[in-house]
């Protein structure tokens, strides 16, 4: 904290430019009036002010508006942004996209901070609900962001937001996450054609049901390997050799290399070695011939 | 990214220094650059600034007419020449440079001692 001391005779700043730069702290503390640095907040981005300096000028402002900072402020605080508080954004009312845009370039390229995260909140919060233009914004800064939120967060996503989608969006998603996206998605891109619905379809598929999966064996969509082994275990599970082979079409030869891992492992232990035999992959594990297969998940819903 | 001041040292009242900031690791033609001085027990303050491009320039009351900043971006250096050296002009020196617009990137800072 500066302790206050009388400005300098000839030293009150009459406008925030760069002489500026060359106060001390506690001169800037004393010779700069907060309601002008309110005004005159968008010169204050284009002033090469050191860390500290910012501190003072954040002060000032914390001062003047101890309930929180009016949008007109916020959407100017450029670097003074890295000086803010998770608790100090908590006060804010942030409701134009470009606010939000504006604060996002201050941090891009770094992770996203506490702060960040606390800004984003407020926004969404303030909307009622993640919308297009939103989402489009905060993937094109943190492209992992939508896996940052939790499958009831997630629920607040209307399907027409998932057209801004990108498939890097979902790379660390997990199958929770998947498993509420991806209703969304089937309903956004339900009036698609064939091919054009699983390019689109096909980054959410880790949360499609079997019954998806077999609809989709039936339209030669040639699903490659990386997207198989994504798959929900349990989805897999129930679809037949055939239904597989048409799933994945000339991919088909890529199960040999995955054998040993999830799903196609689970999977191979479900079919009976003769169906197996049939795609000529020499894939092995599957169930001997003359055996009988029990469903006792069936056996159990029945008693 | 590594700015490194030289120039400093001891000097007669009315004498004459010239620091060096040369950066490593960054080029420097993309940066405002300060430089600033520290003397002891004292606060840090600005002694000059100058713009990416050069075409601005700006200095501390203190040391108008005296000090002048000025860039050479083929050697990835920024200079102070400074002139008429008063006793209150010893501290240490520091440059810093602007990647946005905050002083981002600081040097370890160079000793000057006016006596």
């Known amino acids: 904290e500066v302790e206050k001391t009388a400005c300098p005779s000839g030293k009150k700043a009459r406008e925030i430019d760069e002489s500026l730069i060359f106060y001390k702290k506690w001169e800037l503390e004393a010779c700069v009036d907060a309601a002008l640095l309110a005004t005159q907040m968008d010169r204050v981005n284009a002033i090469p002010f050191t860390y500290e300096q910012l501190d003072v000028l954040k002060h000032k402002l914390d001062e003047l508006y101890p309930q929180g900072y009016p949008e007109s402020v916020i959407q100017h605080l450029g670097y003074l942004f890295l000086k803010m508080s998770p608790e100090d954004i908590r006060k804010w009312n942030v409701t134009s996209l470009e606010t939000l845009k504006a604060l996002l370039e201050v941090n891009k390229g770094h992770e996203m901070s506490p702060q960040v995260a606390t800004l984003i909140d407020r926004f969404v919060k303030g909307r009622g609900q993640l919308d297009k233009d939103t989402l489009d914004t905060l993937t094109a800064f943190y492209p992992g962001y939508l896996c940052s939120l939790s499958p009831e967060e997630l629920s607040s996503v209307p399907p027409s937001s998932i057209w801004a989608v990108r498939p890097q969006d979902l790379d660390t998603c997990d199958p929770r996450q998947l498993d509420v996206l991806y209703p969304k998605a089937r309903l956004a891109f339900q009036n698609m054609n064939g091919s054009e619905y699983f390019v689109k379809i096909q980054s959410f598929l880790g949360g499609a049901p079997t019954e998806d999966l077999k609809a989709l064996s039936q339209q030669n969509v040639s699903m490659d390997l990386a997207t198989f082994m994504k798959l929900r275990t349990d989805a897999v599970l129930p679809l037949t050799v055939a239904e597989v082979q048409k799933l994945l079409g000339p991919h088909v030869e890529g199960l040999k290399a995955e054998e040993r891992h999830r799903p196609v492992r689970d999977w191979i232990l479900r079919q009976r070695q003769d169906d197996l035999d049939t795609l000529g992959l020499g894939l092995q594990g599957g169930i001997p011939n003359g055996y009988l297969v029990l469903d006792l998940s069936m056996q159990e819903a029945l008693s | 990214l590594q700015l490194v001041e030289s120039g400093g040292g001891l000097v007669q009242p009315g004498g004459s220094l010239r620091l060096s900031c040369a950066a490593s690791?960054?080029?420097?033609?993309?940066?405002?650059i300060g430089w600033f001085r520290q003397a002891p027990g004292k606060e840090r303050e600005g002694v000059s600034y100058?713009?990416?491009?050069?075409?601005?320039?700006n200095y501390a009351d203190s040391v108008k007419g005296r000090f002048t900043i000025s860039r050479d971006n083929a050697k990835n250096t920024v200079y102070l020449q400074m002139n008429s050296l008063k006793p209150e002009d010893t501290g240490v020196y520091s440059c810093?440079?602007?990647?946005?617009?905050?002083?981002?990137?600081w040097g370890q800072g160079t000793s000057v001692t006016v006596s």
């Open positions: 810093a440079a602007a990647g946005g617009y905050v002083m981002d990137y």
């Open positions: 100058i713009s990416s491009s050069g075409g601005s320039t």
């Open positions: 690791g960054f080029t420097l033609d993309y940066y405002a």
